[in-house]
């Protein structure tokens, strides 16, 4: 893809220092779609336009990242810039409407489970970790593993700990994690599948 990322970067680089600061502050409170986490305040405030673009894309992927950026710009009163960003990202992109044949997922690697393909994004973006643990307890996770994940202080560190056990899992164990994700954060799964 790349088009949306470039458009986000272009928009952010056109902000004044004061506007960029305001953008970051608004990003900390803007309503997010279900299934998305917030970029941590500490990291966010020190970022330049390039770092912020990369962070937006890694946290929200290109499509939603661009939409979110446009929403914040609009909220700042920068309607024209928001419109330009959305026009740039919609040009030659966007989801196929109902009834249109969807392209094959050529980016997906055969033989690599969805969970493995999207490891980094899942670590960054899964928020409902406790729910996952309860769904996997006794089926995939031992009591010791369950407690070890729960003991971690943040969602990303919990997910990182959970992923430390997956090399020993077979395909069906990974499917059970994926089922739990579909049930708890369906939008995230759908978004990753599109990416």
């Amino acid at each position: 893809m790349g088009r949306a990322r470039d458009a986000i970067l272009d928009a952010l680089e056109n902000l004044t220092a004061e506007e960029l600061k305001k953008f970051k502050l608004k990003l900390l409170s803007v309503p997010l779609r279900e299934g998305y986490g917030r970029i941590p305040r500490g990291a966010l405030l020190s970022m330049d336009a390039l770092d912020l673009t990369d962070k937006l894309v890694s946290f929200y992927l290109e499509t939603y990242g661009a939409e979110l950026t446009a929403n914040v710009l609009r909220d700042m009163g920068l309607q024209e810039m928001a419109g330009q960003l959305q026009a740039a990202t919609h040009q030659g992109s966007g989801a196929a409407p109902a009834g249109i044949q969807a392209p094959p997922q050529s980016a997906a690697k055969p033989g690599l489970h969805f969970i493995d393909q999207h490891r980094a994004a899942l670590i960054a973006r899964v928020t409902n970790v406790e729910w996952l643990l309860d769904a996997l307890y006794g089926k995939v996770l031992t009591d010791e593993q369950y407690q070890a994940v729960r003991a971690e202080p943040t969602n990303p560190s919990k997910m990182r700990k959970l992923f430390s056990f997956t090399p020993a899992w077979n395909w069906t164990c990974k499917d059970l994690l994926l089922q739990a994700l579909r049930e708890s954060q369906s939008y995230l799964v759908e978004d990753l599948e599109r990416s």
């Epitope: 109902a98 009834g99 969807a102 094959p104 997922q105 997906a108 690697k109 055969p110 033989g111 690599l112 489970h113 969805f114 393909q117 077979n170 395909w171 069906t172 164990c173 499917d175 059970l176 994926l178 089922q179 579909r182 049930e183 369906s186 939008y187 799964v189 759908e190 990753l192 599948e193």
Partner: antibody
């Protein structure tokens, strides 16, 4: 192109077992799951379970747990479904099916075998 | 397990008419639903996956919509070859389940 070719029709006695085969071609056998779905005469479709030949792990519908075993032979790219303790209500067409993409976040069945009729009768 | 209920059980229409088939899930399945067509003596054929994506080679007169618990398969203008049984299937959780089917017959 992807092809799934199943073994021929079987007539079995109640209490016995049946083993249906499904030979796959046109893709890398170990990269995709193979599922089994059955259909009793004039009835709907019922998912029985799947195998992932890459690591031989299988998942089953609890309704059949203990009676169904799904296996795969990587050397011949063939999946097998064995159903034991057969009863008359197991009379059905048994299909093997392969999803559109096993490595995506769902299982939708784009490729099907021709079906194998298993008749259970005394 | 998730139960899928299709309605109507039988739909009698003429070629050229619009067909609307429904599938209701017993719990939220988001967009994880597909539709199949089956003709007598044949294996099912995938039409729509993930609620609204048209499978390769399927005519554009077929379309799918819905999310959560209610889904619809629409055939905009029926062709003679469309008269068959249609099944929905959920991919949200195990065991994977199918609806009981809707028979689309010629009026």
């Amino acid at each position: 192109q992807v092809q799934l070719v199943q073994s021929g029709a079987e007539v079995k006695k109640p209490g016995s077992s049946v083993k249906v085969s499904c030979k796959a071609s046109g893709y890398t056998f170990t990269d995709q799951t193979i599922h089994w779905v059955r259909q009793a005469p004039g009835q709907g479709l019922e998912w029985m379970g799947y195998i992932y030949p890459g690591d031989a792990s299988a998942m089953y519908n609890e309704k059949f747990q203990g009676r169904v075993t799904i296996t795969a032979d990587k050397s011949t790219s063939t999946a097998y479904m064995e159903l034991s303790s057969l009863r008359s209500e197991d009379t059905a067409v048994y299909y093997c099916a392969r999803p559109l993409y096993s490595y995506a976040s769902y299982y939708w069945f784009a490729y099907w075998g021709q079906g194998t009729l298993v008749t259970v009768s005394s | 397990e998730i139960v899928l209920t299709q309605s109507p059980a039988t739909l009698s229409l003429s070629p050229g008419e619009r067909a609307t088939l429904s599938c209701h899930a017993s719990q939220n399945i988001n967009v994880w639903l597909s539709w199949y067509q089956q003709k007598p003596g044949q294996a099912p054929r995938l039409l729509i996956y993930k609620s609204s994506n048209l499978h390769t080679g399927i005519p554009a007169r077929f379309s799918g919509s819905g999310s959560g618990t209610d889904f619809t398969l629409t055939i905009s203008s029926l062709e003679p070859e469309d008269f068959a049984v249609y099944y929905c299937q959920q991919g949200q959780s195990y065991p994977l389940t199918f609806g009981q089917g809707t028979k689309l017959e010629i009026k």
